[in-house]
């Protein structure tokens, strides 16, 4: 019965970008400006998302697909479909309720978003620290001390921190 009904339903012939207009004898009408339908057989078109304020338009709305937003410089997307924009911090910092704060000793953040993470524990893998960590960089692990040739220094000072470092994604 369901299949028969759908075959007889004139709305099922309405393609994406149109809607089945009940006010006009179920004729397929194009979506009005600033609206879209991404699938066929729709009885209404959805209102396009508007990218305002800290959001900027990444992809314009079309009759068949919604607009997509990203964030203005200095902010990065959070949530599915970039539902929120969050302030960037510098490398070596994390965003708290009180704003951007430096990473504590023993932690780092090599991006403009996210949290400060503990330096990798190289010994977990039986390795040694090859390059020391900084606020902006994780340690680099190297061979286990037993693998080093006699007289070889095991720890390299950290590479100088540079901007922009890891770009926000």
């Amino acid at each position: 019965f369901e299949r028969t009904r759908s075959l007889q339903d004139p709305c099922s012939n309405c393609p994406a970008g149109t809607f089945c207009d009940n006010n006009r004898n179920q004729i397929c009408s194009p979506c009005p400006p600033n609206s879209f339908s991404s699938a066929g057989g729709q009885r209404t078109c959805d209102i396009c998302r508007q990218c305002k304020g800290v959001f900027r338009t990444r992809k314009e709305c079309s009759s068949t697909s919604n607009a997509e937003c990203d964030c203005t410089p200095g902010f990065h997307c959070l949530g599915a479909g970039c539902s929120m924009c969050e302030q960037d911090c510098k490398q070596g910092q994390e965003l708290t309720k009180k704003g951007c704060k430096d990473c504590c000793f023993g932690t780092f953040n090599d991006q403009k978003r996210g949290i400060c993470r503990p330096w990798t524990n190289c010994s977990l893998d039986g390795k040694s620290v090859l390059v020391n960590g900084t606020k902006e960089r994780d340690v680099v692990c190297g061979p286990s001390p037993a693998d080093l040739s006699p007289g070889a220094s095991s720890v390299t000072p950290p590479a100088p921190a540079r901007e922009p470092g890891h770009s926000p994604q």
Partner: antibody, heavy 119, light 107 residues
Framework: QVQLVQSGAEVKKPGASVKVSCKAS????????INWVRQAPGQGLEWIGN????????NYNQKFKDKATITADKSTSTAYMELSSLRSEDTAVYYC????????????WGQGTTVTVSS | DIQMTQSPSSLSASVGDRVTITCQAS??????LNWYQQKPDKTVKLLIY???RARSGVPSRFSGSGSGTDFTFTISSLQPEDIATYFC?????????FGQGTKLEIK
């Protein structure tokens, strides 16, 4: 020893989705980044994104942001990558990799999963 | 994104030859440069990380050098089992990027 074992080859139709798995063993799964890398036929390597399984924090290459979704299941030490709205140009070998101890290099690679998109 | 320009794209050399591959980054990546070997069966292996550090178990004929934007990978004495494609990769900045690869063949 450290091992990453990927799921088998997949053949999909355009518009479909596919979920590739990467089962880790021989180390503490939550302590290392898992990356996904692709190689189209006759082409070089492209980094898709990565995940830190401890808290499922992800990074994506902007190019793949609308194509790939990376997840991890701590209980089974398995990482996943789902590819949506497949097109013929998504035909490639997909590798999962583990970092060497810090995210800056990839020390262990899975055997690769071939995804073929064809009508 | 940081572009990695690797050369040559292919090379043919004899067993025992010294082979050099170069990789140039479009901006300073400090020492965050890695070299990978992809065998004909598609298996991939990290050989050199942090520019010059050979992974344990990697034969001493493989070495790397450089800093900043210019890097070199050397096989001091080519062996038949070194037939592979070699890739450089920068780990300095997201998104991580690879060179186009160098396909190495034996004469």
């Amino acid at each position: 020893q450290v091992q990453l074992v990927q799921s088998g080859a997949e053949v999909k139709k355009p518009g479909a989705s596919v979920k590739v798995s990467c089962k880790a063993s021989g180390y503490t799964f939550t302590s290392y980044w898992i990356n996904w890398v692709r190689q189209a036929p006759g082409q070089g390597l492209e980094w898709i994104g990565n995940i830190y399984p401890s808290d499922s924090y992800t990074n994506y290459n902007q190019k793949f942001k609308d194509k790939a979704t990376i997840t991890a299941d701590k209980s089974t030490s398995t990482a996943y990558m789902e590819l949506s709205s497949l097109r013929s140009e998504d035909t490639a070998v997909y590798y999962c990799t583990r970092d060497y101890g810090s995210a800056y290099s990839m020390s262990t690679w899975g055997q690769g999963t071939t995804v073929t998109v064809s009508s | 994104d940081i572009q990695m320009t690797q050369s040559p794209s292919s090379l043919s050399a004899s067993v025992g030859d010294r082979v050099t591959i170069t990789c140039q980054a479009s901006q300073d990546i400090s020492n965050y440069l890695n070299w990978y070997q992809q065998k004909p069966d598609k298996t991939v292996k990290l050989l050199i990380y942090y520019t010059s550090r050979a992974r344990s178990g990697v034969p001493s004929r493989f070495s790397g050098s450089g800093s900043g934007t210019d890097f070199t990978f050397t096989i001091s004495s080519l062996q038949p089992e070194d037939i592979a494609t070699y890739f450089c990769q920068q780990g300095d900045t997201l998104p991580y990027t690879f060179g186009q690869g160098t396909k190495l063949e034996i004469k």
